[in-house]
């Protein structure tokens, strides 16, 4: 199972409004769990059905999240990244990298 990054990417700014059940997605990654070769970034691992992200439709499983509300996600431990999302407020701006 090789997570080597060798694909074309595009970036997008996605603005989500936290719904009744939150933002509605899961993440993996961080400096303590490298899901992609030579990359400790934060990736979307699951979009929850009927959650805010799913209803918006732009965020996809496998996307890399570069920043949250302008805060860079580089060099974060996994739990620190989780906490950043959980404390991001009602309106959440995500800078994401999609695979093409």
């Amino acid at each position: 199972m090789n997570g080597r990054v060798d694909y074309l990417v595009t970036e997008e700014e996605i603005n989500l409004t936290r719904g009744p059940s939150g933002l509605g997605f899961n993440i993996v990654g961080g400096t303590d769990q490298q899901y992609v070769s030579n990359d400790s970034g934060i990736y979307v691992s699951r979009i929850k059905e009927n959650g805010a992200a799913a209803l918006d439709g732009r965020l996809q499983e496998g996307d890399k999240i570069l920043s949250v509300n302008g805060q860079d996600l580089k060099n974060l431990l996994h739990q620190d990244a989780v906490d950043l999302f959980r404390n991001a407020g009602y309106a959440v701006s995500l800078r994401v990298q999609h695979r093409l």
Partner: nanobody, 132 residues
Framework: QVQLVESGGGLVQAGGSLRLSCAAS????????MGWFRQAPGKERELVST????????????????HYADSVKGRFTISRDDAKNTVYLQMDSLKPEDTAFYYC??????????????????WGQGTQVTVS
């Protein structure tokens, strides 16, 4: 997207052994935990055992942390074959109270939402274990 297929269930006498298998196919990127649950007739589904999946440099590695319900500690052993994307549950010294449908489940990462627990995202159809 993700399929989990259990096998290995059956009828066994008390004191006997069975080995359950759960093969994962489809998307495996982001899989962080695999677990076994069981549900006996008229009872709630309960956790049996889990194994965390270690990712290093884009690959899964063996040696993930394991957890067992008190009722199966010392009798059941969970393991994972990374190459086959399969998790196993070796069940020894089986007791009649182990009779249940056994389900495999997979979790993909951590929820970013406080109010949503880190529940399991995908489930298999289950395999029946009967201990007489």
């Amino acid at each position: 997207q993700v399929q989990l297929v259990e096998s290995g269930g059956g009828l066994v006498q008390a004191g006997g052994s069975l080995r359950l298998s759960c093969a994962a196919s489809g998307r495996t990127f982001g899989m962080s935990t695999m677990g076994w649950f069981r549900q006996a007739p008229g009872k709630e589904r309960e956790l049996v055992s889990t194994i965390s999946i270690i990712w290093r440099d884009g690959r899964t590695q063996s040696g993930g942390r394991t957890h067992y319900a008190d009722s199966v500690k010392g009798r059941f052993t969970i393991s994972r074959d990374d190459a086959k994307n399969t998790v196993y549950l070796q069940m020894d010294s089986l007791k009649p109270e182990d009779t249940a449908f056994y389900y495999c489940a997979a979790r993909f990462g951590s929820s970013v939402d406080v109010i949503i627990p880190d529940d399991y995202d995908y489930w298999g159809q289950g395999t029946q274990v009967t201990v007489s």
